[in-house]
């Protein structure tokens, strides 16, 4: 906290600007009007303050505002948006996409800050909902971004959104989000002929069910063997060997070099051994020849 | 992560002069106003000099006359000429721009020691 004393003659200060950076801290107390400062602050981020400085700015805001600064003022923090900790941004009201921006600006090529996640959720919470342009906005920002939302979240997200997706900001996500986002995004492309459509749910699949896929192996689309090796194993066991062959196309011969890991390996243990065989990859581990199958799940929904 | 790195430092007699070269690592300096800070030993960090993206100067008071601030975008070079030092200008020197300053983001600065 910066003692109260009286500014010096000659040194109140009538604009903002780079002779600040000359005062000491109990001289930028003293000399600057927080009215000033405010109706200015699209200048502070052009002048090299000092951390120590900025300190004392942004207290005097907050003198100004106790209840939380105006939107006006928050668009043109810049810098000074860096010394604010959540507890001052759970005050703020930001409904403009442009301060929002501004603010993740400041932040741009750094890991999200808590005080970037608290802006972000205060922002989103304002507008009920994430819209394609702020999930453009901030999937830009933050590729990351989708991926760092829970399941409930991710529910708020209406279809028309994910043509913002692009496949990076799918990276981190777990199956649990991509269960959600899936049918959202099969909605969104819904009108999209086949191979197009491809190109644009594949990021998506590691939530599609098994009937999906087998639609989608009667498409001629060449899953490529990372995107088959993200898709869920529950819906990758019922698929026979003609199947995943259609589905892989001329990416079928990369199963031998998965064949320890799943799904691909549940699923090996799934098929009949002289079924594998005809794929002519050296496949181990099917249902040796003779052996009945029981699907046990079937057994009891039947009882 | 945009490196500061401050050069030209010495040492020098009362009366001399020093011209102080700051280099950054990234095109920061176009568009950005920089300034030039020391910090003698036991006092803290005070700017003595800063020139706005225009090419505007500005000087602490004491400094005025015997400082010159200029730069050099091209190279992302800034310059500090010191004329007539005295032993109170002894210090650290360090150079930065508005985004380093406000995160506390330094380079290792460059000794100036005026002592006959």
């Known amino acids: 906290e910066v003692e109260k004393t009286a500014c010096p003659s000659g040194k109140k200060a009538r604009e903002i600007d780079e002779s600040l950076i000359f005062y000491k801290k109990w001289e930028l107390e003293a000399c600057v009007d927080a009215a000033l400062l405010a109706t200015q602050m699209d200048r502070v981020n052009a002048i090299p303050f000092t951390y120590e400085q900025l300190d004392v700015l942004k207290h005097k805001l907050d003198e100004l505002y106790p209840q939380g600064y105006p939107e006006s003022v928050i668009q043109h923090l810049g810098y000074l948006f860096l010394k604010m900790s959540p507890e001052d941004i759970r005050k703020w009201n930001v409904t403009s996409l442009e301060t929002l921006k501004a603010l993740l600006e400041v932040n741009k090529g750094h890991e999200m800050s808590p005080q970037v996640a608290t802006l972000i959720d205060r922002f989103v919470k304002g507008r009920g909902q994430l819209d394609k342009d702020t999930l453009d906005t901030l999937t830009a920002f933050y590729p990351g971004y989708l991926c760092s939302l829970s399941p409930e979240e991710l529910s708020s997200v209406p279809p028309s959104s994910i043509w913002a997706v692009r496949p990076q900001d799918l990276d981190t996500c777990d199956p649990r989000q991509l269960d959600v986002l899936y049918p959202k995004a099969r909605l969104a492309f819904q009108n999209m002929n086949g191979s197009e459509y491809f190109v644009k749910i594949q990021s998506f699949l590691g939530g599609a069910p098994t009937e999906d896929l087998k639609a989608l192996s009667q498409q001629n689309v060449s899953m490529d063997l990372a995107t088959f090796m993200k898709l869920r194993t529950d819906a990758v066991l019922p698929l026979t060997v003609a199947e995943v062959q259609k589905l892989l196309g001329p990416h079928v011969e990369g199963l031998k070099a998965e064949e320890r890991h799943r799904p691909v390996r549940d699923w090996i243990l799934r098929q009949r051994q002289d079924d594998l065989d005809t794929l002519g990859l050296g496949l181990q581990g099917g249902i040796p020849n003779g052996y009945l199958v029981l699907d046990l799940s079937m057994q009891e929904a039947l009882s | 992560q945009v490196q500061l790195v401050e050069s030209g430092g010495g040492l020098v007699q009362p009366g001399g002069s020093l011209r102080l070269s700051c280099a950054a690592s990234?095109?920061?300096?176009?568009?950005?106003?920089v300034a030039w800070y020391r910090q003698a030993p036991g006092k803290e960090r005070e700017a003595v000099a800063v020139?706005?993206?225009?090419?505007?100067?500005k000087y602490a008071d004491s400094v005025k006359g015997r400082f010159t601030i200029s730069r050099y975008n091209a190279k992302n070079i800034a310059y500090l000429q010191m004329n007539s030092l005295k032993p109170e200008d002894t210090a650290v020197y360090y150079c930065n721009t508005a985004r380093g300053a406000a995160v506390d983001s330094w380079g290792q600065g460059t000794q100036v020691t005026v002592s006959s």
């Open positions: 990234g095109s920061i300096f176009s568009g950005n106003a």
């Open positions: 020139i706005t993206r225009d090419g505007d100067t």
